[in-house]
Amino acid sequence: QEGNHEEPQGGLEELSGRWHSVALASNKSDLIKPWGHFRVFIHSMSAKDGNLHGDILIPQDGQCEKVSLTAFKTATSNKFDLEYWGHNDLYLAEVDPKSYLILYMINQYNDDTSLVAHLMVRDLSRQQDFLPAFESVCEDIGLHKDQIVVLSDDDRCQGSRD
């Protein structure tokens, strides 16, 4: 199955643009509870040189702070390295760039290892369509349905998205 592996225009760049967080999951519930380190929300993404740059919204003191992060490519095509509250192996588990994206992270912080998954969509009005896919990916990586938190508009910094 040889092929042209040079990424063409419209390759990883298809992930660029606005995204909306829909659901989070973790084996450590404190991480995704309000004020948890991983209760963060995607605002937008861009791709350059095979790396993913994300603007995320972090709730802080009743407001939302926008922070820029970069996930660096690795030798494995769907795996990226991200430094955020320790080291994260970030995996893009299931992707449709025009519709939804499911990622999960293996986080290592102070000798503690955690698993966090994130569902994001392009169009919030279709968020229910992709929850079954998220539940399925969570199941595949060992997270149960009761470890999933579906976000509401109030949760995800909707007022801070401009």
């Epitope: 592996h5 419209g10 390759g11 769907n78």
Partner: nanobody, 125 residues
């Protein structure tokens, strides 16, 4: 084990049309991509078009955009490639492929796990 069978190839005049079909049998993934790739003699296999089973999202190589259309029938596990305004440079063996919605399925062959045997398309001038 998934099996993919292509059909519909053949010889056609330039500016003509063909419809390729790919039938998948066996156990597929929950959500998957089906793609078409092609390989001309002496060239590398290249992406042509792909579609997601759950969303119907489609992607095309720049060289075929506006001329080719990919469509799916999930109930029958088939994907068709409608090829119009064919050019001699479209001559190649066309392969159908199936895989999960891994990063890159919309432009790259690597995310695909299963491949058909290919069907020859020849466009004469």
């Amino acid at each position: 084990e998934v099996q993919l069978v292509e059909s519909g190839g053949g010889l056609v005049q330039a500016r003509g049309s063909l419809r390729l079909s790919c039938a998948a049998s066996g156990r597929t993934f929950n959500n998957y991509a089906m793609g078409w790739f092609r390989q001309a003699p002496g060239k590398e296999r290249e992406f042509v078009a792909a579609i997601a089973s759950n969303t119907g999202t489609t992607y095309y190589a720049g060289s075929v955009k506006g001329r080719f259309a990919i469509s799916r029938d999930n109930a029958k596990n088939t994907v068709d490639l409608h090829m119009n305004s064919l050019k001699p440079e479209d001559t190649a063996v066309y392969y159908c492929a199936l895989g999960p919605l891994r990063l890159g399925w919309w432009y790259d062959s690597r995310p695909y796990d299963y491949w058909g045997q290919g069907t020859q398309v020849t466009v004469s001038s």
